[in-house]
Amino acid sequence: QKKGAPHDLKCVTNNLQVWDCYWKAPSGTGRGTDYEVCIENRSHSCYQLEKTNIKIPALSHGDYEITINSLHDFGSSTSKFTLNEQNVSLIPDTPEILNLSADFSTSTLYLKWNDRGSVFPHHSNVIWEIKILRKESMELVKLVTHNTTLNGKDTLHHWSWASDMPLECAIHFVEIRCYIDSLHFSGRKEWSDWSPVKNISWMPDSQTKVFPQDKVILVGSDITFCCISQEKVLSALIGHTNCPLIHLDGENVAIKIHNISVSASSGTNVVFTTEDNIFGTVIFAGYPPDTPQQLNCETHDLKEILCRWNPGRATALVGPRATSYTLLESFSGKYVRFKRAEAPTNGSYQLFFQMLPNQEIYNFTLNAHNPLGRSESTILVNITEKVYPHTPTSFKVKDINSTAVKLSWHLPGNFAKINFLCQIEIKKSNTVQEQRNVTIKGVENSSYLVALDKLNPYTVYTFRIRCSTETFWKWSKWSNKKQHLTTEAIPSKGPDTWREWSSDGKNLIIYWKPLPINEANGKILSYNVSCSSDEETQSLSEIPDPQHKAEIQLDKNDYIISVVAKNSVGSSPPSKIASMEIPNDDLKIEQVVGMGKGILLTWHYDPNMTCDYVIKWCNSSRSEPCLMDWRKVPSNSTETVIESDQFRPGVRYNFFLYGCRNQGYQLLRSMIGYIEELAPTVAPNFTVEDTSADSILVKWEDIPVEELRGFLRGYLFYFGKGERDTSKMRVLESGRSDIKVKNITDISQKTLRIADLQGKTSYHLVLRAYTDGGVGPEKSMYVVTKENS
């Protein structure tokens, strides 16, 4: 175009519907210039105007010829331009912030603006740039892009931004601009101008303030603190660590803490100091709640559900910042909250949830929440399978009869729909405990009853009980123990009875043993002894317990003696024994030796013995009648071990084995023996009966049984040259080769001649007896042989 004609045609649009085209006037033209603008499109349009710009409707795609005629005083000039959409710039109108507000407690800015979308013909993407500036010096803090879409109508947009620095610390400015990224527009797209700036500031009073106050943050976070002050701030500390000051407007300062450490329960102090004062705030650095661990729900009573859990990792936040828990049941929509006062027991927390009528399956979600976050755990539970009964209370025992009792107890809860498995522990004194399991139908009223049989009469039992449901989840704790004595019953057996004739053979002495408690079935009060023959029955007067012996004058006819034990309920069956022994001519006395504590006796099976066998024993040295104790063993036995606290080693006892038929006893074997053999306590007394020049005859006596302390097995006779009261060695001193020893194993031998001796020589003689228990002490003598004649 010529310089004297209109030139530099440019077109812009702010809404894609109208193009605003402007040009530069020809040089030298004044105010009174008119323009004729013609646009060559389908219909030739011309416009008359007095200014250097024109708004025209947006042209469709393609090239258009624009003719601008300038008409002025000194003539006219014409310029032709080719106009295409690609030559047009899209520059949106300057946006305006409708509202800027702040939430100081969260340091968040809230921005509101209108996109004026109604002026645009079709949908377009819009990019917004939001600029945050801080301090009076308007330092750029943040430049963010935010995408929206134009949808043909005016839309309000909201945007928020959380500041890393508390908003109270400094003035914050915000401005926005936009860029319309229209797919339908092929021209140049440009950013709008920045909006007028808006700001937010905190109105301080005259007091110095530190921000934020009581903030809860995640361990490891970064945080900024500031002090709004009229005085010069000299230092800042977090805990004991000095922090570099960041200067804000006026005397205001800030500090930035990176990667903050976990706080103590009282929080972490942040302190600013001035010349004269100190100002503080507390920060609580902790963790969000961990997922509740080991969530478990059970019921004690089918009325209330108890859910327990472990909080997991500690949050380091306490008091009002501690984790709060809510237990939600999704089928019913009901929930309960954990009250902080219900402090955790041994590291686990618990909550009670009221059971709902006719609901057995519960879907629990436990929500944990603290200022830093939330977490949850879920559990699906059929509560009838998770019954942990209370400890049974009011546990009582009542008699039914002597072998049965009734147990009653209280188990709180409504268990009408389930069965219990209860375990009863039965303990008899000094015996192992027995456990019996019983199944009981659950009831609504909490009272339970069970009968227990197969007990022993007159026995002290200790009972206790625990219960679980039949489907078994947990045993209840054991109830208190209840001690109970069952009632008496008649004695189940007659006393174990024996008899001996007195030493003069005129009286029969009857002995019996007290009945064991499990046969006495009560306290034995007395005994009845009676004596019967074919002609008559004679009853002795009642013998009170604890007397266990009676004496009757009897002739040598055969009598049957009966002994009956009586308690408060009644009498035992009679124990019967014949007064006379069945003779046995073929009897030898045998030797037996025990095993330290007792003695094993064996015998051959004898089918004639129909009632039992009796082993009787006594101390050999005691006078008649020989009875220390007796033991009955069944008729099918062929051996027994006799043990008694009265047995002593080295004491000789007589043992008698009797067999019984028709209440009559026959002596089958007679034995003497020791529980344990010991060495003799004395040496045999010996004398020299005769001496010659080359021999000596020695004679000795028996050792009494009491001193023998075992079965005599032989003698040891030592002899050798030796003189009394000299330094020459004694016979028994070791290492002497001239000592001679004779072992005499024939215990009936009582003399010994020693030959081949030297005449007129002194000999030392020593005699010792031995048993299987050892060698006894020595007896010694010095003898001088005669001179050779």
Epitope: H240, S266, G267, V271, N277, I278, T281, P320
Partner: antibody, heavy 122, light 108 residues
């Protein structure tokens, strides 16, 4: 057990000086901030001064700033309050108090002495 | 400075009764920096509550504290004979550390 024993109180004329001491025992004195608090007869409590556990900082109530000096001797487990230019309105029972938090700043006062009476009178 | 006001000035109650003592600050106080003390005649004060709600060592659980910002409360749930005394609130978050004027709890 923690014990704080104040001494040095008495009757003094206006304009004169007095030095109060507080002997501490039963705790690690050098790890706790210490304060002086006073109570005029029949009146409420008034905070007077604080000194940090290490003695690095001291702060005062406006009513005593420039006249009173708080100090401590950690080797002797003793806290001091040097009171100059005393006035009638300084008449009070003076308590020394230990701050609750071990090695912390800005704490409540968990242990107090039995107090010593300062009477400023002509 | 932060001014603390306490109300009521005197509280007359019977043993077993519930006492609610109020403390108001002239400007916001961090709850972490508010304490309550009890003082009996002729004795030094005794720390009851710190951090607005935490009980000091050995303080019975009938004493509880609550509140935030400018309004704080000390509650004694069941007054025992030994609880009749003067109660002070204190802020220790910025110097000068200030006490309230005190509330006297006496026997009705």
């Amino acid at each position: 057990q923690v014990q704080l024993v104040e001494s040095g109180g008495g009757v003094v004329q206006p304009g004169r000086s007095l030095r109060l001491s507080c002997a501490a025992s039963g705790f690690t004195f050098s790890s706790y901030g210490m304060d002086w608090v006073r109570q005029a007869p029949g009146k409420g409590l008034e905070w007077v001064a604080v000194i940090w556990y290490d003695g690095s900082n001291k702060f005062y109530a406006d009513s005593v700033r420039g006249r009173f000096t708080i100090s401590r001797d950690n080797s002797q487990n003793t806290l001091y309050l040097q009171m100059n230019s005393l006035r009638a309105e300084d008449t009070a029972v003076y308590y020394c108090a230990r701050e609750l938090w071990f090695g912390e700043l800005l704490s409540p006062f968990d242990f107090w002495g039995q107090g010593t009476l300062v009477t400023v009178s002509s | 400075e932060i001014v603390l006001t306490q109300s009521p000035g005197t509280l007359s109650l019977s043993p077993g009764g519930r006492a609610t003592l109020s403390c108001r600050a002239s400007q916001s106080v961090s709850s972490s920096y508010l304490a309550w003390y009890q003082q009996k005649p002729g004795q030094a004060p005794r720390l009851l509550i710190y951090g607005a709600s935490s009980r000091a060592t050995g303080i019975p659980d009938r004493f509880s504290g609550s509140g935030s910002g400018t309004d704080f409360t000390l509650t004694i749930s069941r007054l025992e004979p030994e609880d009749f005394a003067v109660y002070y609130c204190q802020q220790y978050g910025s110097s000068p550390f200030t006490f309230g004027p005190g509330i006297k709890v006496d026997i009705k």
